[in-house]
Amino acid sequence: MSVTACQGLGFVVSLIGFAGIIAATCMDQWSTQDLYNNPVTAVFNYQGLWRSCVRESSGFTECRGYFTLLGLPAMLQAVRALMIVGIVLGVIGILVSIFALKCIRIGSMDDSAKAKMTLTSGILFIISGICAIIGVSVFANMLVTNFWMSTANMYSGMGGMGGMVQTVQTRYTFGAALFVGWVAGGLTLIGGVMMCIACRGLTPDDSNFKAVSYHASGQNVAYRPGGFKASTGFGSNTRNKKIYDGGARTEDDEQSHPTKYDYV
């Protein structure tokens, strides 16, 4: 694969991943009410990083923002921070990579500068993807922990009125945003790796520019064998890699209703 193609594809994959990270961060369905083995309710709860929502079978949906910083769990704050850092790094990565793209000519910028910028954007995308993956994974771990804790509470006796009155505890499971986040983080990471690979192809090989003296009998001629490498030929530097391009499929929250509780 040519450097231009590798760099371009890396940029596009990173861009898709970055868009996915933004989508996941903004989505309300990070955690959704677990309906398995629960009495079927006419109310469905789901939560995001920024607000929690309730959808009634009537079709009425009410969302409330988390209007406090101090009252929120440290883990939620950490996940928010990781996702925002991922987005910020992604923005910088995109800006840098636009200037680094080989197909775009900006002034007298040489390949060496473009290579450095490509490497920089690649590293930024890798870190951005890692931030998203860690953020989503931390949230998922938090959900799993809370899920089993609430399950234990469920079966450790129902309180109130001598056990006559049952209180149903709302348990939460993985929401669509987690899967979007994982896929998006992965794509951003893959795109970043591709950019780094493209950088290696953009870097001029120093050995091609070294003058070598050959002493022929009776003559003292210094010459450079092979001359300069043509800018399109990369010889052994070319890596034949097959890039698997996945797509982050997202579903709109308000239209996503395929749950056993919901009939609207």
Epitope: T41, A42, C53, S58, R64, Q166, T170, Y263, V264
Partner: antibody, heavy 118, light 113 residues
């Protein structure tokens, strides 16, 4: 304004079936659930089930599964409830209602009296 | 199914009197997501369909006089009529709107002395 107009009273024999209609007006029929409620003479209210007119999706009270079948016709903005294998226990007033905030029933039909008698 | 227990089954009142009726559910109707109780109160007069009075346990439907007040949370709910009028004589039902199947209480009948 929102209105639900139900079909007239029915007098039918045991073992037969009856189809009660509920014509909606004054709102987007497909956007709101229609619920059905049974009330026997001098008795309380029983929820039969609901239908989403937009998708045709239904949710029945287990007690009425096999007894009631809920359908809806979007073109005429009408919801239907068919009651089969009727017995004297099915003699009651049947109401249709439109869902509202809090899953409550804000708008009701006038009721259809079904009398099962030999 | 959720059992809704209403008490008393009937109340004899005079005009201007304050009336309180109770409704208890076998499971909590409080949704943790929005901290709302999915309990509804209806009024039914003879030969008429029920009329929505209060939803979310305490939210009065538009057009309902402010003498009607709903309160309570979880499993214990109350409907209060601050000053009963002649037109308030009817049967009052509470309903679970949280769990399927939706269930109604057996009703509290308000009669005049």
């Amino acid at each position: 304004q929102v209105q639900l107009q139900q079909s007239g009273a029915e007098l039918i024999g045991p073992g037969t079936s009856v189809k009660v209609s509920c014509k909606a007006s004054g709102y987007a029929f497909s956007n709101y659930l229609i619920e059905w409620v049974k009330q026997r003479p001098e008795q309380g209210l029983e929820w039969i089930g609901l239908i989403n007119p937009g998708s045709g999706g239904t949710n029945y009270n287990e007690k009425f599964k096999g007894k009631a079948t809920l359908t809806a016709d979007k073109s005429s903005s009408t919801a239907y409830m068919q009651l089969s294998s009727l017995t004297s226990d099915d003699s009651a007033v049947y109401f249709c209602a439109r869902v509202y905030y809090g899953n409550s029933f804000a708008y009701w039909g006038q009721g259809t009296l079904v009398t099962v008698s030999a | 199914d959720i059992v809704m227990t209403q008490s008393p089954s009937s109340l004899t009142v005079t005009a201007g009197e304050k009336v309180t009726m109770s409704c208890k559910s076998s499971q909590s109707l409080l949704n943790s997501g929005n901290q709302k109780n999915y309990l509804t109160w209806y009024q039914q007069k003879p030969g008429q369909p029920p009329k929505l009075l209060i939803y979310w346990a305490s939210t009065r439907e538009s057009g309902v006089p402010d003498r009607f007040t709903g309160s309570g949370s979880g499993t214990h709910f109350t409907l209060t009529i601050s000053s009963v009028q002649a037109e308030d004589l009817a049967v009052y039902y509470c309903q679970n709107d949280y769990f399927y199947p939706f269930t109604f209480g057996s009703g509290t009948k308000l009669e005049k002395k």
